[in-house]
């Protein structure tokens, strides 16, 4: 639709956007599976979480993610001082005081025990590229992904719209 | 200013075709979902059709899936709705809307254009 | 399909007269739930979204609560200008759909 430069284009103000108010306007509780419906699990191991794509057993119960949603204020390409649109960031916690984290250096997605106001690692832009799909991009690198690799969750770069739909960028929320 | 213009409407015969565009400035126009809705004469308000902001996603409900196609032209800052083998029932004052967040569907319309009248009869 | 079912579909009230409005949805789905108002000859016009949130430059005496099923639109205070029909629409499951309509007249 708007190839790489436009990527690029809308991706470039991430940076620069702004949360506003520290309260989110909505809080919502939901499984996460991937576009091929392996569920997101967290398992406590050694003292530290660890995430893992799997398929679950037929009665298993999915594990639960609390998305918090934030109004993110965009500026104005055109004039510079404008607002030109919102976007919406999510944080997302599986258990009490444990929230996803971005670590860009090492591309990959962890969790991390912190207290708020949580940093910007640990929040993520929120795209809709299906009805009922959602993609995760990094607050802190935009233009990257939470994508799945090898049955782990994984920071991947997407460098085209075409791209942007590829089904390992892919979620799925539920409620059940 | 955000502004939603359409055109196109009209009145055609029962099995014809129209194509509605809407013209939308004061955004980036490349970074929304883009939806038409329709309104039936003294009726209530009906989803048409979605677009994903890539543009690599359309939707529709059952009454026009097959015979409604929605495209964009970003390079344009266009929206369009052709309609194809068209009914009675089709006839409505047609409006373009934009998504309130950039990438994604969540939080309802908050800009409506004007409306353009479809009126399909013999 | 999500079937949305909005009551009453009209009332007559008077200004200053405290309003409001159901929204009871067929199945449970997260808050992506928007409150609309349309005058005669008009565009529909956002008031609420996220089932709470007002909409820019919207009069603060407008306000939207509920969550699973059930969500609710209260005028505070009515006023002249509020008399016009309401809509509430979900945003969580495709199709989209919208209530029927609720009209609001001068009693």
């Known amino acids: 639709a708007f190839g790489i430069s436009g990527v690029q284009k809308y991706t470039r103000a991430l940076h620069d956007s702004s949360i506003t108010g520290i309260s989110p306007i909505t809080e919502y509780l939901a499984s996460l599976s991937t576009y091929n419906d392996q569920s997101i699990t967290f398992a406590l191991e050694d003292e530290s979480y660890e995430i893992y794509v799997e398929d679950l057993k037929k009665d298993e119960k999915k594990d639960k993610v609390l998305l918090s949603y934030y109004e993110s204020q965009h500026p104005s390409n055109e004039s510079g001082d404008g607002v030109d649109g919102k976007m919406l960031m999510v944080t997302l916690s599986p258990t009490k005081d444990f929230w996803l984290h971005a670590n860009n250096k090492e591309h990959s997605v962890e969790l991390h025990k912190c207290e708020k106001p949580l940093p910007d690692q640990a929040f993520f832009v929120l795209h809709n590229m299906h009805s009922n799909c959602v993609s995760f991009e990094c607050k802190t690198d935009p233009g990257v992904f939470i994508g799945v690799k090898d049955n782990h969750l994984a920071l991947i770069k997407v460098d085209s719209s075409e791209n942007l739909c590829t089904e390992n960028i892919l979620f799925k929320l539920s409620e059940t | 200013e955000v502004q939603l213009v359409e055109s196109g409407g009209g009145l055609v015969q029962p099995g014809g075709s129209l194509r509605l565009s809407c013209a939308a400035s004061?955004?980036?126009?490349?970074?929304?979902?883009m939806t038409w809705i329709r309104q039936a004469p003294g009726k209530g308000l009906e989803w048409v059709a979605s677009?994903?902001?890539?543009?690599?996603?359309?939707y529709y409900p059952d009454s026009v899936k097959g015979r409604f196609t929605i495209s964009r032209d970003d390079a344009k800052s266009s929206l369009y709705l052709q309609m194809n083998s068209l009914r009675a029932e089709d006839t409505a004052v047609y409006y373009c809307t934009r998504a309130n967040y950039y990438y994604n569907t969540y939080g309802g319309f908050p800009y409506w254009g004007q409306g353009t009248l479809v009126t399909v009869s013999s | 399909d999500i079937q949305m079912t909005q009551s009453p579909s009209s009332l007559s009230a008077s200004v200053g007269d405290r309003v409001t409005i159901t929204c009871l949805a067929s199945e449970g789905f997260s808050n992506d739930l928007a409150w609309y108002q349309q005058k005669p000859g008009k565009s529909p016009k956002l008031l609420i979204y996220?089932?709470?949130r007002l909409q820019d430059g919207v009069p603060s005496r407008f306000s939207g609560s509920g969550s699973g099923t059930d969500f609710t639109l209260t005028i505070s205070s009515l006023q002249p200008e509020d008399f016009a029909t309401y809509f509430c629409q979900q945003g969580s499951k495709y199709p989209l759909t919208f209530g029927g309509g609720t009209k609001v007249e001068i009693k």
């Open positions: 996220a089932a709470s």
């Open positions: 004061g955004f980036t126009f490349n970074n929304y979902w």
């Open positions: 677009i994903t902001y890539t543009g690599g996603g359309t």
